[in-house]
């Protein structure tokens, strides 16, 4: 039961995380205008991975896409790539993990197969979360670097008279969404990996079964049980015995009351 709960929770946490990564990637507020030097600006600038926006005094917001690919900073391209890789891996992970859920029955899929799929999706979630965290962190680092560079060059003009205040950018909401979402995806992935260990069929200590054959007594001990870890062979676990000895039931799976679709 604990395994099912861990797996289900891991799936839900990862699902929320990936939704957050998608939201962060699409958001326009990766960097927002720093209002420290002009808290009463009527023109507010903010930028995303795909477009930059300006909110004017009228309340109207104008956004313009980055229509160039080659003209964009390499760092921005790298962040885009990391976020997209994170989304793709996360989406595949979600797809795999749906079929891996213990509470969902698909034909005669064995626990070893589900364990394999759970581990695969868990690893995908972990990598997805790391990609998102890395992408957001690279962007944040870029912002910090640019912030201090623009602070150093901020005041231009002659004779010390301030004429132009260079627009500085600080962390936008998308960065925080991305960090949290990446963290959730990572946690979900770890939970899936933990659940995978519980799903993998382990060696069961079967009690000795004794019965009377014609004329003599033989005690059978379960020495011939072939255990599968769930990571290698996908063959059906068999108990090797002679004659018609009654054996313990195979490891039972406990279907949940609810199927998660």
């Amino acid at each position: 039961m604990a395994v099912t709960a861990c797996q289900g929770l891991g799936f839900v946490v990862s699902l929320i995380g990936i939704a957050g990564i998608i939201a962060a990637t699409c958001m326009d507020q990766w960097s927002t205008q720093d209002l420290y030097n002009n808290p009463v600006t009527a023109v507010f600038n903010y930028q995303g991975l795909w477009r930059s926006c300006v909110r004017e005094s009228s309340g109207f917001t104008e956004c313009r896409g980055y229509f160039t690919l080659l003209g964009l900073p390499a760092m921005l391209q790298a962040v885009r790539a990391l976020m997209i890789v994170g989304i793709v891996l996360g989406a595949i992970g979600l797809l795999v993990s749906i079929f891996a859920l213990k509470c969902i029955r698909i034909g005669s899929m064995e626990d070893s197969a589900k364990a394999n799929m759970t581990l695969t999706s868990g690893i995908m979630f972990i990598v997805s979360g790391l990609c998102a965290i890395a992408g957001v962190s690279v962007f944040a680092n870029m912002l910090v670097t640019n912030f201090w560079m623009s602070t150093a060059n901020m005041y231009t003009g002659m004779g010390g008279m301030v004429q132009t205040v260079q627009t500085r950018y600080t962390f936008g909401a998308a960065l925080f969404v991305g960090w949290v979402a990446g963290g959730l995806t990572l946690i979900g992935g770890v939970m899936m990996c933990i659940a995978c260990r519980g799903l993998a069929p382990e060696e069961t200590n079967y009690k000795a079964v004794s019965y009377h054959a014609s004329g003599h007594s033989v005690a059978y001990k379960p020495g011939g049980f072939k255990a599968s870890t769930g990571f290698g062979s996908n063959t059906k676990n068999k108990k090797i015995y002679d004659g018609g000895a009654r054996t313990e039931d195979e490891v039972q799976s406990y279907p949940s009351k609810h199927d998660y679709v």
């Epitope: 600038n45 004017e56 005094s57 109207f60 205040v165 627009t167």
Partner: antibody
Framework: QVQLVQSGAEVKKPGASVKMSCKAS????????MHWVRQAPGQRLEWIGY????????SYNQKFKGKATLTVDTSASTAYMELSSLRSEDTAVYYC????????WGQGTTVTVSS | DIQMTQSPSSLSASVGDRVTMTCKSS????????????LTWYQQKPGKAPKLLIY???TRESGVPSRFSGSGSGTDFTLTISSLQPEDFATYYC?????????FGGGTKLEIK
């Protein structure tokens, strides 16, 4: 077409209050902030403040804080400005202004403060 | 607050003349986010509400005749009327649309010579 129709002229005594309205039509009222500007006789135009019809958020010129109160009734597509503790210096034409680039102005409400 | 200074305060000209008026701001009105200067020009006739002529320092509002043109960047701006028409005699105001409080210039009154 986009139009702002303001309430009629008001004559008030010093210390009194006045509430004027600005009815918007021809556009989605919540799309743009509603700004208020005044013009005293022979003076330059002065920005009073604005209200965001979406959330009722306001921003005021420091000079008019405590003097002007901006409100909206989105269901009626109408913005209001109330001026309190009127003095003779508040005698002016008050305009509501909206849309992008602050392109559309009301016809103005003349407020005369006289004892 | 950003101070807006217009010059001259009044100007006499004849129909057909080319007229130029200037507006200076105490701080730059240039927004690096979209590379625009947030300066607006209005025309006001007696007893009427101001009418938008130019926004972003040089972009003409739709319906405004092409004889009106705006130029300038940062802190120095100019409004030019290439060939004065009788209906152009009015007061012209520049406005800072970049920083709150939004501020207006004192106006340039264009009179018939």
């Amino acid at each position: 077409q986009v139009q702002l129709v303001q309430s009629g002229a008001e004559v008030k005594k010093p210390g009194a209050s006045v509430k004027m309205s600005c009815k918007a039509s021809g556009y989605t009222f919540t799309d743009y902030n509603m700004h208020w500007v005044r013009q005293a006789p022979g003076q330059r135009l002065e920005w009073i403040g604005y209200i965001n019809p979406n959330n009722g958020g306001t921003s005021y010129n420091q000079k008019f804080k405590g003097k002007a109160t901006l409100t909206v009734d989105t269901s009626a597509s109408t913005a209001y400005m109330e001026l309190s503790s009127l003095r003779s210096e508040d005698t002016a034409v008050y305009y509501c202004v909206t849309t992008r680039y602050l392109a559309v102005w009301g016809q103005g409400t003349t407020v005369t403060v006289s004892s | 607050d950003i101070q807006m200074t217009q010059s001259p305060s009044s100007l006499s000209a004849s129909v057909g003349d080319r007229v130029t008026m200037t507006c200076k701001s105490s701080q730059s009105l240039f927004n690096s986010g979209n590379q625009k200067n947030y300066l607006t020009w209005y025309q006001q006739k007696p007893g009427k509400a101001p009418k938008l002529l130019i926004y972003w320092a040089s972009t003409r509002e739709s319906g405004v005749p092409s004889r009106f043109s705006g130029s300038g960047s940062g802190t120095d701006f100019t409004l030019t009327i290439s060939s004065l028409q009788p209906e152009d005699f009015a007061t012209y105001y520049c406005q800072n649309d970049y920083s709150y409080p939004l501020t207006f210039g004192g106006g340039t009154k264009l009179e018939i010579k």
